[in-house]
């Protein structure tokens, strides 16, 4: 299973519950062998993934893996949705699975949902 291909370690159908107004870092774990690939984030709009050009991103390097991070400072209600990272590697485009952010807009919610509610009833999370 080890190879020198670039691999993007975002789980299929991964989901996160986050609060508007809080900071949040969305990580794209990247494995590569020699040269670090060019990585970008995009946000899904239907079947199209719109590149996020003007957002703050950074790299975090660890021993066996690197993380390309999309920063939300702070999270806004319209950050709700699905995101994907992509890597350019030897003229190939490698796309991650999409990951979904469920944003709770605390101002418009009469009461902050519990973690269990947020996890089990994502349709409540963005009102």
């Amino acid at each position: 299973k080890e190879s020198c291909d670039v691999q993007l370690y975002i789980k299929r159908q991964s989901e996160h519950s986050i609060l508007a107004g809080d900071p949040f870092e969305l990580e794209c774990p990247v494995k590569y062998c020699a040269n670090r690939p060019h990585v970008t984030w995009c946000k899904l709009n239907g079947t199209t993934c719109v590149k996020l050009e003007d957002r703050q991103t950074s790299w975090k390097e660890e021993k066996n893996i690197s993380f390309f991070i999309l920063h939300f400072e702070p999270v806004l209600p319209n950050d709700n949705g699905s995101y994907r990272c992509s890597a350019n590697f030897q003229s190939n485009l490698i796309e991650s699975h999409s990951t979904t952010l469920y944003v709770t807009d605390v101002k418009s919610a009469s009461e902050r949902p519990s973690k269990d509610e947020m996890a089990s009833r994502p349709w409540l999370l963005y009102r």
């Epitope: 975002i10 789980k11 299929r12 991964s14 519950s17 699905s82 796309e95 269990d116 089990s120």
Partner: antibody, heavy 119, light 112 residues
Framework: QVQLVQSGAEVKKPGSSVKVSCKAS????????MYWVRQAPGQGLEWIGR????????RYAQKFQGRATVTADKSTSTAYLELSSLRSEDTAVYYC????????????WGQGTTVTVSS | DIVMTQSPDSLAVSLGERATINCKSS???????????LNWLQQKPGQSPKRLIY???KLDSGVPDRFSGSGSGTDFTLTISSVQAEDVAVYYC?????????FGQGTKLEIK
């Protein structure tokens, strides 16, 4: 290789709760999804819910919403299913299973835990 | 919820003969990555289920190559090319695309 070991059989009274554990080895559970399925005597398989141990995000079948709670402890590589307000129809074998979150490389099931609900 | 319907409910096959089990989903099983997350499980008497096939046609490691999976859209098939005595089991299809995950009702394979 990936293995799951579940807690032992339980006999419970109607209206009570049960908590079943499932300990994983051979894998870092943050790289997986862990899920629970039950099988009533002589019946088929019924999906209860799943958790992403990396962030604790759980999903449930509507039938079990509010009655089932799936949790995971990364430090001990253990997932838990708690089922409350038990009734006789909850008598079943409860299986935990784990699959690779990224590439579908593995899907492994525990040995099952028999839960009997009887007055 | 996605309904998974298997046919037949049971079948009896002679040793060495071919067995075919069908599975129909009530909706497409394509995920956002364009792949169909359709799995086949084998449950032998008194044992836990075990995945045989994932992504419609990919064999799990250690699964004999007499097992194969095929299909697309909403119609899927598990084939055992030459049934052996150890294949006696209940076989389930299940979808790992939509929430909640759902299983077929199972097909019991017996030896004639």
């Amino acid at each position: 290789q990936v293995q799951l070991v579940q807690s032992g059989a339980e006999v419970k009274k109607p209206g009570s709760s049960v908590k079943v554990s499932c300990k994983a080895s051979g894998v870092n559970i943050k790289d997986t999804y862990m899920y629970w399925v039950r099988q009533a005597p002589g019946q088929g398989l019924e999906w209860i819910g799943r958790i992403d141990p990396a962030n604790g995000y759980a999903r449930y079948a509507q039938k079990f919403q509010g009655r089932a709670t799936v949790t995971a402890d990364k430090s001990t590589s253990t997932a838990y299913l708690e089922l409350s307000s038990l009734r006789s129809e909850d008598t079943a074998v409860y299986y935990c299973a784990v699959n690779d979150g990224y590439f579908e490389y593995f899907d492994v099931w525990g040995q099952g835990t028999t839960v009997t609900v009887s007055s | 919820d996605i309904v998974m319907t298997q046919s037949p409910d049971s079948l009896a096959v002679s040793l060495g003969e071919r067995a075919t089990i069908n599975c129909k989903s009530s909706q497409s099983l394509l995920d956002s990555d364009g792949k169909p997350y359709l799995n086949w499980l084998q449950q032998k008497p008194g044992q836990s289920p075990k995945r045989l096939i994932y992504l419609v046609s990919k064999l799990d490691s250690g699964v004999p190559d007499r097992f194969s999976g095929s299909g697309s859209g909403t119609d899927f098939t598990l084939t055992i090319s030459s049934v052996q005595a150890e294949d006696v089991a209940v076989y389930y299809c299940w979808q790992d695309t939509h929430f909640p995950r759902t299983f077929g009702q199972g097909t019991k394979l017996e030896i004639k």
